[in-house]
Structure formats: C-alpha cells, structure tokens
Amino acid sequence: PPRGRILGGREAEAHARPYMASVQLNGAHLCGGVLVAEQWVLSAAHCLEDAADGKVQVLLGAHSLSQPEPSKRLYDVLRAVPHPDSQPDTIDHDLLLLQLSEKATLGPAVRPLPWQRVDRDVAPGTLCDVAGWGIVNHAGRRPDSLQHVLLPVLDRATCNRRTHHDGAITERLMCAESNRRDSCKGDSGGPLVCGGVLEGVVTSGSRVCGNRKKPGIYTRVASYAAWIDSVLA
C-alpha cells in the first residue's frame, strides 16, 4: 500500500510545485520525493524497505497521477542510496537519494528545489508547506491529484513530551503540528517547504495521523548537508 497521506489539506495548484516527485513501485505511487538536483530526487529510506524485487521509478512534472499531462515523465532509477545509518526500526536518518537514469528535462513544471544548508532550527510557529499524493481521509480515499497543507512548525521540546513523541525527536529531526491537518505514512519522502526552501522530508515511521498529540516528524535536510553533497558529487 502507498506510504502516506495528506489529511485536512486541499488540492494543490497544478504544477506550482515543480520539485514534487512521486516515487513509484511497479507503476503505483509509493512515496513522495523532491527533486534536489537535475538527476537526483530526495525521499525517505523506509520507502524502499519492501521494494526488494519491484521496479522503482520516479514521476516528475505531474499533478494528476492518472491523466496525461505534457510535463509528466517517468524516469527509471539508476541508483538508490539510502542513508548508511538508516534502520528499519527507527525514524532516524530516514533519507534516500535516487539517481535518475538521466538528467531530468527541466521546465516550468520540473525544477529542483533549493534545500537548506544552514543547520539552524526553523522557528516554532513558522508555516511550512507539505504536499503529497497520500490518502486524504481516514477512510483511505486516495487522491489522483497532488494535495497540500500548510502546517506550523512545533518546537522540539513540546514534540519530545511523553504524550507526544517522548524523547524520540533528535536535533536532526523537526516536528510540525498535526491537529486534523497532517502528513502521514503515505506522504513519506515528500518535502516540507518553509519560505521556498526545503527544510524537511516526511519520515516514514508509522504513527497516528491528524492527532494533535502526535505531531508530524520530518528529517531536517540541513543536518545531512555533508552526506547529500557527498552523494551528489
């Protein structure tokens, strides 16, 4: 099943997020992703855990998953590079870099997103945008078109409270509020964008969605700048 959902959001403006990628397994949407360089998409390591024998591809330039669109193109994956410290049973280091079989054809609907290199926390309360093709309600309805939602960043101390994530949120992770509006498993690998810059990647650990006491968890890309640069080099 696809890993993720946007809850309480709305349909995104078509092609207004040209960095948005759909990571696909055997032709079906699996996870979100974000184009960070002409030939590289950043996603979540856990997304490929169950993809051992399947065909992984990346869809760029899409708004609708099913409808033909001039900007849409499906790319094969030349190389998948999970973060070396990612492990199945933790949310830590949940990053994956996918090298496309060729450089993406850039245009208004396909363009890399600048990512944060300065390792400093986003201020609590900052509104950030998260988008994805995950299911849109608890009944499991899957959208065909890209959804998005604006979420305020939550301070790490609150996120680390026993009734929230009880100490699991390291300096390399960040949280966003989850009161009915939320990202969830199926949006894993998708971008959290603050002020036009990629700040976080949706983690793919299992958690309740849309419950304000269980905030969304995002991997802070700035904390992994050295690793990203080393892979892209």
Epitope: P124, D155, R156, A157, T158, N160, R161, R162, T163, H165, D166, G167, A168, I169, E171, V208, N211, K213, K214
Partner: antibody, heavy 116, light 112 residues
Framework: EVQLQQSGPELVKPGASVKISCKAS????????KNWMRQRHGESLEWIGD????????AYNQKFKGKATLTVDRSSSTAYMELRSLTSEDSAVYYC?????????WGQGTLVTVSA | DVLMTQTPLSLPVSLGDQVSISCRSS???????????LEWYLQKPGQSPNLLIY???NRFSGVPDRFSGSGSGTDFTLKISRVEAEDLGVYYC?????????FGGGTKLEIK
C-alpha cells in the same frame, strides 16, 4: 552523557525565599521540558510543575501555585525554581527531571531545610 | 487529581523470589491520544528515582528483563521475576496522562 547537576543544600529561615538551580549537560537544553518534583522525608514524590525551555511557558500543580516559580537561562543551560514564603512544611528534597523519554534523567536532588 | 494507590506498602522478600506490586488509579489513565502513560520508578536509599517501565509495559533501556509491567484502564502491576539485592528500594507508580501528573505512595521492597 546526560547530566542534571543541582545546586547544594539550603538552610533557610521561615518566611524567606530560596532559588535552586539545575544545570543540564550532555544534550541540547532547549529540546526537552524540565519538570520539578518535591519529596518530603519518608514520603512519596509530588509534581510541582514544568517549563518549556524555548518559550519559558510554565504549568504548575495547583497546590504549588504562588509557592514555586520556574524559570530558565538558555545561555547557561540552567533551569531554576524559586520557592517563597517558606515554612517548615516546605522542608524537602527537590528534584529536577528531564521529560523525554518519560522522566529518564533526574538531578541528584537539593535538600531544602526550613528552620528558625 | 488522579489518586494512585499502591499495594502493599511494604514487601519483605527473599532473594530469588518472584514479587508483584499493584497500582490502582482513581480514574482511567488512558490519554486522549489513546496511549496509557503509566510508569514505574525505583528509588534506592539516598538516590534519585530511576525509570524502569514506561507506557505500562515497555522496559527502559538497560533495565533487566526480570522486570515486567502489565495492566490497563485503572489496574496495573509491576512484576519482578527473581529479586536481586540491587532491586531493593522503594517502587513508585506514576501517571502522566492527566494534569497534574501523580505518583503512587510507594512500595518498599526489603529483605525479610
């Protein structure tokens, strides 16, 4: 290694105030709430209140409102608790504890003795 | 406030014994998020409390597997399968689901 180092024992007179400290090391101070507990001699623990080190927001047990005031100094990674209008009933060991995971990390305790 | 009642108050044991400590809350301590924040702490003489069990049955890292927690709703139990000398002290249950968080009165585990 996570450590919470509390200030030393205090002997204070009735009616006076005392401010005890809890210095954190081995982790990022602003990433976890700080909680305070009281334990009178031979008794159980009572939760006094907590503080968010980012915002300074506090929550208190109704029982300790007006008695305890919690503050933090982020520059020195230190949490403080001031106790005022002390009586013999306030003689106890006071603990700070980091919240997350649970109360896994505690200070060593500060003994406050109120005596004329 | 949620009252946490522990029994027994004192528990004389021999080393190697299996023992159980009971904790009852005056109301359900299931949090609105669905989790139950029931914890167990051990306080040895002259020391700060140590976390043993969180969320009813999860052992904190480094806690020996002879400690186990169980229960739901309002009734909870801590079991020690084979008591060792280092286990002696006062055991406290704690609920963190409701404000203010509250501790039980304590159970003193001592040698017979």
């Amino acid at each position: 290694e996570v450590q919470l180092q509390q200030s030393g024992p205090e002997l204070v007179k009735p009616g006076a105030s005392v401010k005890i400290s809890c210095k954190a090391s081995g982790y990022t101070f602003t990433s976890y709430y700080k909680n305070w507990m009281r334990q009178r001699h031979g008794e159980s623990l009572e939760w006094i209140g907590d503080i968010n080190p980012n915002s300074g927001d506090t929550a208190y047990n109704q029982k300790f409102k007006g008695k305890a005031t919690l503050t933090v100094d982020r520059s020195s990674s230190t949490a403080y608790m001031e106790l005022r209008s002390l009586t013999s009933e306030d003689s106890a060991v006071y603990y700070c504890a980091r919240e997350g995971p649970s109360f896994a990390y505690w200070g060593q305790g500060t003994l406050v003795t109120v005596s004329a | 406030d949620v009252l946490m009642t522990q029994t027994p108050l004192s528990l004389p044991v021999s080393l190697g014994d299996q023992v159980s400590i009971s904790c009852r809350s005056s109301q359900t301590i299931v949090h609105s998020n669905g989790d139950t924040y029931l914890e167990w702490y051990l306080q040895k003489p002259g020391q700060s409390p140590n976390l043993l069990i969180y969320k009813v049955s999860n052992r904190f890292s480094g806690v020996p597997d002879r400690f186990s927690g169980s229960g739901s709703g309002t009734d909870f139990t801590l079991k020690i399968s084979r008591v060792e000398a280092e286990d002696l002290g006062v055991y406290y249950c704690f609920q963190g689901s409701h404000v203010p968080p509250t501790f039980g009165g304590g159970t003193k585990l001592e040698i017979k």
